[in-house]
């Protein structure tokens, strides 16, 4: 299937303007500068006829403005001014924004918990699975299997750092080297960003809301799959990440620190514990083979134990293993020898919810995964209802340039990396680049942040958290000192050699294009989200790792075809954009594919149909289960009773379509559709109005 | 108290076969292994072997394999060393032994002894 | 099979003396040795058991001491009681082993 969907009648230079052009698609310059225009997005819209595309009538009358639906939107003040009101008024309005900024700040506190709660939830359903990934003995040999194994235990855990302890544990107690132990921390890096993607998914109900927050979440993954992209391979050929840290951690005599100031837990762990708890020693000791953990309970029942070492004597099956020579003896029959152990006994039990209920993990893990959803989804539908009433008009304008807007000149590129550092500072002082990237998300959405802003932000957040790592490893104890420090630092390497790959230079901000992309081809067809996320966190690694235990043979053997199908799909199309006359004609565009291969067109309307059925019996549920209907089906009228997504479709048909503006060079005359562009009045209708 | 009681003196034939029982009372019978020792005129102790009663698991002396048989009759609480192929220098007392210090071979009670004479 | 080597075959002493038996076992057997006693026409008794743990009973004039391969039964003030046979035992390894023993007699 050719990358780029809509390919339907593409001219020569196809790749402008398609919904999914990984390319920052060119604009008409920005005429609202000189109207003193606040919102492009405002801006009318010529309508014109669609013109055959040798014509030059479109380029002479051109629209005034092009909608970009990157463009910030500008949220009105339709409230009365500070100065027009009286006194009462005045202190009304006072307690009212002291009102919203507690309840802003209240669902921001269940937002994190709700993110809390979901990664237990995740450790329940599939933290023995993840557990079991890594007692596979492949993982030394292959280091593609390696990274698939990291991302998929981060996605089953929804936590890095649980995978990332797992593997310093396994490396401490030589299950594993350093070499090995690289491409699953690669991987853990990917599967740490589906949380943030998943956040962005809750924001599906607003076309252009869910473009920016999708786009923005999915950044940070194409980030780390480019990354891994170029880096693994460079790993694996040089072991640079390897040789760098050995150098650094032999260099230094580290004494053992504390451990990192948990900041944002002191104030979140005295709810969650109430919820549940979870014993996450039991996912460390399946992934390192103890039979005996597999049939124990993540769910914690008992908090306060007394553990008491003895020494005991047990029978052994010969003298050979017995501990030493000199405490090995026998009654006559069998052979003993003396073990310290160490006798645990429940004191008292843990104070949640779950604790008398003696629920299989799968059962507490699925109830707290649709809770932990309804709640994260509640809380973000709410949060980007009050800071869209609070970041209206002359607020918003200050937010927004403070934010978004560059140092003066000759110091605008120091910018960017000021954001990393404050991203960088923000998630070591919440202790998760989860929880930083997630709550970054529907403000990318509502607007406050642009994406070109929300990117190094993003890569600052990568830092913070292996700076945790690090300071963690700090804290270990002598045995698991050395390699959960080196392997920290290869965590840290791997993110500053990210960084140089994908930020100093604008022209290799490639993330921000594909993210774009995506992003518009998500905008247009919600279902595609899902697709990306299922195919990219779940199907990839999941075929690579069946394929690397079926043998390297098989892998190379299905995975080299596959590889240089890419690469021509990619060639073809770089051609195609840059120098078509170069390709015979029929390969200047992709007219010679069948339409499913070319365009979401078709597969929407499989979708569609599949979804059919689900159209009416989710009509009258409460407003929060309208996004998750519109994500899934992407259907008009399955929300009937907000009339949101009626209203939406109405608006949409109603509308013409523009022609792009004449600077870009070509005359390919191509729907608003297809350049992933939406009406403005999409951008206002709400669809969880509560 | 703990008494092993042991059958009396036998005269035996080279080849033949020695059974000589070993009756325990005053503890839990299947609870501790219970071993055999012999001494022969003026020598010192050789272990033979032990079974426990419990399960019957036996561990026989490399010496005696493929001689010595130890059984026991858990209704009866007797305990059976049976010794077969018979030669002179099997002449010796025959001490039953019950070991109640758990878990190790010391042996801290003893039957009287039955003293097996092997001649022609 | 450890073979333990017991000294000396045996002595003769004033009641009231201190006597000390040594055993020596031909490998490492940690603590895993007992000490019997035998007197003439008698079963066994046991003394120590674990090297240094007296049985129940016996009189805290025996003493034992020793680890690994040597190993020492001391009866601290020899008593007309105390003339007998001394075994000592390893039960480290199967099969169980006994010293020679050391008679011990009054002059």
């Known amino acids: 299937m050719a990358p780029w969907p809509e390919l339907g009648d593409a001219q020569p230079n196809p790749d402008k303007y398609l919904e999914g052009a990984a390319g920052q698609q060119p604009t008409a310059p920005d005429k609202s500068k000189e109207t003193n225009k606040t919102d492009n997005t405002e801006a009318p819209v010529t309508k014109i006829e669609l013109l055959p595309s040798y014509s030059t009538a479109t380029l002479i009358d051109e629209p005034t403005e092009v909608d970009d639906p990157w463009n910030l939107p500008t949220l009105q003040d339709s409230g009365i001014k500070w100065s027009e009101r009286d006194t009462k008024g005045k202190i009304l309005c006072f307690f009212q924004g002291i009102g919203r900024l507690i309840l802003l700040l209240g669902f921001l506190y269940f937002f994190v918990c709700s993110l809390d709660i979901l990664s237990s939830a995740f450790q329940l359903v599939g933290g023995k699975m993840a557990g079991q990934f890594f007692s596979n003995s492949s993982i030394m040999s292959n280091p593609l299997l390696g990274l698939v194994i990291g991302v998929l235990v981060t996605v089953l855990v929804q936590s890095s750092s649980t995978s990332t302890s797992i593997v310093v544990s396994m490396v401490s107690s030589s299950l594993l080297t350093v070499r090995a132990a690289i491409p699953i921390i690669m991987g853990a890096n990917i599967g740490t960003s589906i949380t943030n993607t998943i956040v962005a998914l809750m924001q599906v109900g607003d076309r252009s809301e869910f473009r920016r927050a999708f786009a923005g979440a999915t950044v940070h993954d194409f980030f780390n799959w480019l990354s891994v992209l170029v880096l693994l391979p460079v790993e694996v050929a040089t072991h640079y990440l390897e040789i760098i840290t050995q150098l650094i951690v032999e260099s230094f005599h580290f004494k053992n620190g504390e451990d990192a100031p948990d900041l944002l837990k002191v104030i979140t762990k005295p709810f969650t514990k109430l919820i549940v708890q979870l014993d996450k020693k039991v996912i460390s000791q399946i992934a390192m083979n103890d039979e005996k953990a597999k049939n124990k309970s993540l769910v914690k029942i008992w908090c306060k134990t007394f553990t008491n070492k003895t020494q005991i004597n047990v029978t052994v099956p010969s003298t050979a293993n017995c501990t030493s020579p000199s405490l090995c003896w026998t009654d006559g029959i069998q052979n003993w020898t003396m073990k310290n152990v160490t006798y645990k006994e429940n004191i008292a039990k843990c104070q949640h919810i779950f604790v008398n209920f003696h629920l299989p993990d799968l059962a507490v893990g699925t109830i707290l995964l649709i809770l932990s959803l309804l709640v994260l989804c509640g809380c973000l539908i709410m949060i980007v209802k009050i800071l869209g009433s609070v970041l209206k008009g002359q607020v918003a304008t200050v937010i927004k340039k403070t934010i978004n807007t560059d140092f003066p000149f000759p110091f605008a590129w120091l910018t960017g990396y000021l954001a990393i550092l404050v991203g960088a500072g923000m998630t070591f002082i919440v202790q998760s680049s989860s929880v930083f990237t997630s709550a970054l998300t529907p403000l990318i959405g509502i607007g406050v942040i642009t994406i070109e802003r929300a990117y190094p932000l993003t890569l600052g957040s990568n830092i913070g958290t292996t700076t945790t790592a690090i300071l963690a490893a700090l804290a270990s104890p002598g045995n698991a000192l050395r390699s959960s420090l080196q392997i920290a630092l290869c965590h840290f390497f791997f993110n500053i050699s990210g960084i140089l790959l994908w930020y100093p230079i604008p022209f290799t901000r490639l993330p921000i294009r594909m993210a774009k992309g995506l992003g518009n081809i998500s905008a247009k067809y919600r279902w595609f989200a899902v697709f990306y996320l299922i195919i990219f966190f779940f199907l990839i690694p999941l075929t690579v790792f069946g394929l690397s235990l079926a043998g390297w043979r098989v892998l190379v053997g299905v995975g080299v075809p596959v590889v240089f199908i890419i690469i021509l799909v990619l060639c073809l199309r770089l051609l195609q954009s840059r120098c078509p006359r170069v390709l015979p004609k029929k390969l200047q565009n992709w007219n010679f594919l069948p339409l499913w291969m070319r365009s979401l067109k078709p597969w929407d309307a499989v979708v569609s149909k599949f979804t059919g059925c689900f159209q009416m019996r989710c009509c009258c549920c409460c407003r929060v289960c309208c996004r998750a209907c519109c994500l899934l089906c992407d259907c008009p009228k399955c929300c009937r009773c907000s009339k949101c997504c009626e209203d939406l479709e109405e608006a949409q048909e109603g509308q013409d379509v523009p022609v792009k503006a004449p600077e870009t060079f070509d005359n390919i005359t191509i729907s608003r559709e297809a350049q992933g562009e939406v009406p403005a009045s999409d951008s206002k209708t709400e669809c969880t109005a509560l | 108290q703990v008494q092993l009681v042991q059958s009396g003196a036998e005269v035996k034939k080279p080849g033949a076969s020695v059974k000589v029982s070993c009756k325990a009372s005053?503890?839990?019978?299947?609870?501790?292994?219970m071993h055999w020792v012999r001494q022969a005129p003026g020598q010192g102790l050789e272990w033979m072997g032990a079974i426990y009663p419990g399960s019957g698991d036996t561990s026989y002396n490399q010496k005696f394999k493929g001689r010595v048989t130890m059984t026991r009759d858990t209704s009866t609480s007797t305990v059976y060393m049976e010794l077969s192929s018979l030669r002179s220098e099997d002449t010796a007392v025959y001490y039953c032994?019950?070991?109640?210090?758990?878990?190790?071979?010391?042996?801290?009670?003893w039957g009287q002894g039955t003293l097996v004479t092997v001649s022609s | 099979d450890i073979v333990m080597t017991q000294s000396p075959s045996s002595l003769s002493t004033s009641v009231g003396d201190r006597v000390t038996i040594t055993c020596k076992a031909s490998q490492d057997v940690g603590t895993a040795v007992a000490w019997y006693q035998q007197k003439p026409g008698q079963s066994p008794k046991l003394l120590i058991y674990?090297?240094?743990t007296r049985h129940t009973g016996v009189p805290d004039r025996f003493t034992g001491s020793g680890s690994g391969t040597d190993f020492t039964l001391i009866i601290r003030s020899l008593q007309p009681e105390d003339v007998a046979t001394y075994f000592c035992?390893?039960?480290?390894?199967?099969?169980?082993?006994f010293g020679s023993g050391t008679k011990v007699e009054i002059k």
């Open positions: 674990w090297t240094s």
């Open positions: 035992q390893q039960y480290s390894r199967i099969p169980l082993t």
């Open positions: 005053g503890y839990t019978f299947i609870t501790y292994n």
């Open positions: 032994a019950s070991s109640t210090i758990i878990t190790t071979g010391a042996v801290d009670y």
